[in-house]
Amino acid sequence: VSITKCNSDMNGYCLHGQCIYLVDMSQNYCRCEVGYTGVRCEHFYL
């Protein structure tokens, strides 16, 4: 799978994680930090 960094306009899209662009799927994706979930890593779970 080819990945690259998200465009600058997506800065802040992922609240607790890193935004990556999945080139083959044409999708931005939030890779969440440990303890966070959700489309934008907005939910904390214990």
Partner: antibody, heavy 116, light 106 residues
């Protein structure tokens, strides 16, 4: 399926304000950004600004700063664009556009006519 | 704001011709460019995103290329149904559309 349904056509007098709504269904606007783009008759496409409904953060094109306000109501899954101090040059079709995980998905457009 | 200079503003070509449109950005946009087709009275239709990724259902005669500040959109063999106005859009930093290219049949 995913939809962005915009409010109906408006006719306004110069100096007035207009507020266009954009109701999302099939997805949560908190997962997206909502952009606003306009197109005057016979003219090109012009980006106006956008909102991050989750953070309630906005970005506007410089030429619209102070005249446009983009808001979002996450309880009704609806975004709004209000443009004030209308002039004849603001006559255009206004589009809301979803961006975020996937690339742009457009509403059907709202015609705003400014005429005395 | 990033400026997008699109050329030509209009062109006339014959059916079967190869048509090329260019967009030049005022700074590096890291391949974050999309191309739209718009027919009169219709909303814009997304053809290509991320420089060269064709949208599902878009004919393979449409293609895109480029990097840095210089990008190209090509119709390899112009068809009558391709008569429309085409716009580039940079979405690396905020958003800026090119001025559009009106494509007509000669």
């Amino acid at each position: 399926q995913d939809q962005l349904v915009q409010s109906g056509a408006e006719v306004k007098k110069p100096g007035a304000s207009v507020k266009v709504s954009c109701k999302a269904s099939g997805f949560n606007i908190k997962d997206t950004y909502i952009q606003w783009v306009r197109q005057a008759p016979g003219q090109g496409l012009e980006w106006m600004g956008r909102i991050d409904p989750l953070r309630r953060q906005t970005k506007y094109r410089e030429k619209f700063e102070g005249r446009v306000t983009i808001t979002a109501d996450t309880s009704t899954n609806t975004a709004y664009m209000e443009l004030s101090s209308l002039r004849s040059e603001d006559t255009a079709v206004y589009y809301c556009v979803r961006s975020g995980r996937e690339f742009d998905f457009w509403g059907q457009g709202t015609l705003v006519t400014v005429s005395s | 704001d990033i400026q997008m200079t699109q050329s030509p503003s209009s062109l006339s070509a014959s059916v079967g011709d190869r048509v090329t449109i260019t967009c030049k950005a005022s700074q590096d946009i890291h391949k974050y460019i999309a191309w739209y087709q718009q027919k009169p009275g219709q909303a814009p239709r997304l053809l290509i995103q991320y420089t060269s990724t064709l949208q599902p259902g878009v004919p393979s005669r449409f293609s895109g290329s480029g990097s840095g500040t210089d990008y190209t959109f090509t119709i390899s063999s112009l068809q009558p149904e391709d008569i429309a106005t085409y716009y580039c859009l940079q979405y690396d930093n905020r958003r800026t559309f090119g001025g559009g290219t009106k494509v007509e049949i000669k």
